[in-house]
Interface confidence: low
């Protein structure tokens, strides 16, 4: 009870999740790789590794670039995070998945879910990624 | 309950530009997209374009561009379109719709450009 | 811009008569969305993702289709079903709308 919890700089996860539908669309939040910035005074860069398809604003938004159908080849990519003044360099994997049509849905109420989901109102157009205790 | 409720019906002269509002209850607004639709009288729909509020992205339909300013404002919860150089071609019923299907429609603002 | 094509643009139907209307889109979409309008009243989504039913549409409604090709179907007509039907594509922006078909009671 007396534990201090140390602030670790870097990326919270090793993945970041986010369930979404079929169509992605140009502008469209993705998900928040939010970066923990202990001192508060790192000014930090993001990048993406697919910056053709995804783009990373200064508070850690993912969104899409274009529109595009979620597909395989988009299902797993790099964001780096880069400290201006150290050069210092961070990454973290973005994985999204293709959320189920709603009777799909229905069907597996039981099975399991990961951690991090995209609730019922975040979805084919919109979105920012919320943590979800389940 | 969900509601997108428009603002009310307008009579505008031709040149002059119009403001019409789209207030949303019952959901976190910046959680969905907001589109607009226009229907002229007897005809089908058109649409004109988004604004995802949550980062301020717009989207046109290249035919709106220039005539359709999408804006909105997250402290109220409100989308905002403003059409501007109005000509009679402009008179129709206006929708603003948003969902995660585009499930929700406001009951559509009434325009209408005569002199 | 992909042109959604809907046919037909009028027609009539029987009470207890099966109902198919069709929309093509000029290029090839992912899915297809539907929308029931009544007259002086706000469309309503009718059908999502190609087949999906909106919440509250009755079971006799149905939709498929995959690529250029899209229709809805009414298993057994009602008064209640007469309306106007839009497609709507989100795959690319435009999000264009179809001309609508007009279901009629015979």
């Known amino acids: 009870s007396g534990e201090i919890a140390l602030c670790k700089t870097g990326f919270p996860e090793d993945v970041y999740s986010a369930v979404l539908s079929k169509d992605v669309h140009e502008g469209q939040p993705l998900l928040n790789v939010k970066f923990s910035n202990c001192n508060g005074k790192r000014k930090v860069q993001y990048e993406s590794s697919e910056p053709a398809d995804f783009k990373v604003d200064e508070d850690g938004m993912v969104y899409a670039v274009r529109s595009f159908p979620l597909s395989s080849e988009h299902a797993k990519f790099l964001i780096y995070a880069q400290d201006k003044e150290t050069q210092e360099k961070w990454q973290v994997a973005v994985k999204l998945s293709l959320k189920p049509t709603l009777t799909e849905e229905s069907v597996k109420e039981s099975a399991e879910v990961e951690e991090i989901v995209f609730p019922r109102q975040f979805s084919k157009h919109s979105g920012h990624l919320q943590r979800q205790k389940r | 309950e969900v509601q997108l409720q428009q603002s009310g019906p307008e009579l505008v002269k031709p040149g002059a530009s119009v403001k019409m509002s789209c207030k949303a209850s019952?959901?976190?607004?910046?959680?969905?997209?907001m589109h607009w639709v226009k229907q002229k009288p007897g005809q089908g729909l058109e649409w004109i374009g988004y604004?995802?509020?949550?980062?301020?992205?717009?989207k046109y339909n290249e035919k709106f561009k220039g005539k359709a300013t999408l804006t909105s404002d997250k402290s109220s919860s409100t989308a905002f379109m403003e059409l501007s150089s109005l000509t009679s071609e402009d008179s129709a019923v206006y929708y603003c719709?948003?969902?995660?299907?585009?499930?929700?429609w406001g009951q559509g603002t009434t325009l209408t450009v005569s002199s | 811009e992909n042109v959604l094509t809907q046919s037909p643009a009028i027609m009539s139907a029987s009470l207890g008569e099966k109902v198919t209307m069709s929309c093509r889109a000029s290029?090839?979409?992912?899915?297809m969305y539907w929308y029931q309008q009544k007259s002086d009243a706000s469309p309503k989504l009718w059908i999502y993702?190609?087949?999906n039913l909106a919440p509250g549409v009755p079971d006799r409604f149905s939709g498929s289709g995959s690529g250029n090709s899209y229709s809805l179907t009414i298993s057994s007509m009602e008064g209640e079903d007469a309306a106007t039907y839009y497609c709507q594509q989100f795959s690319s922006p435009p999000f264009t709308f179809g001309s609508g078909t007009k279901l009629e009671i015979k």
């Open positions: 290029s090839s979409v992912n899915y």
């Open positions: 019952g959901y976190t607004f910046t959680s969905y997209l």
């Open positions: 604004i995802n509020p949550y980062i301020d992205v717009t």
């Open positions: 719709a948003g969902g995660d299907y585009e499930d929700y």
């Open positions: 993702y190609t087949s």
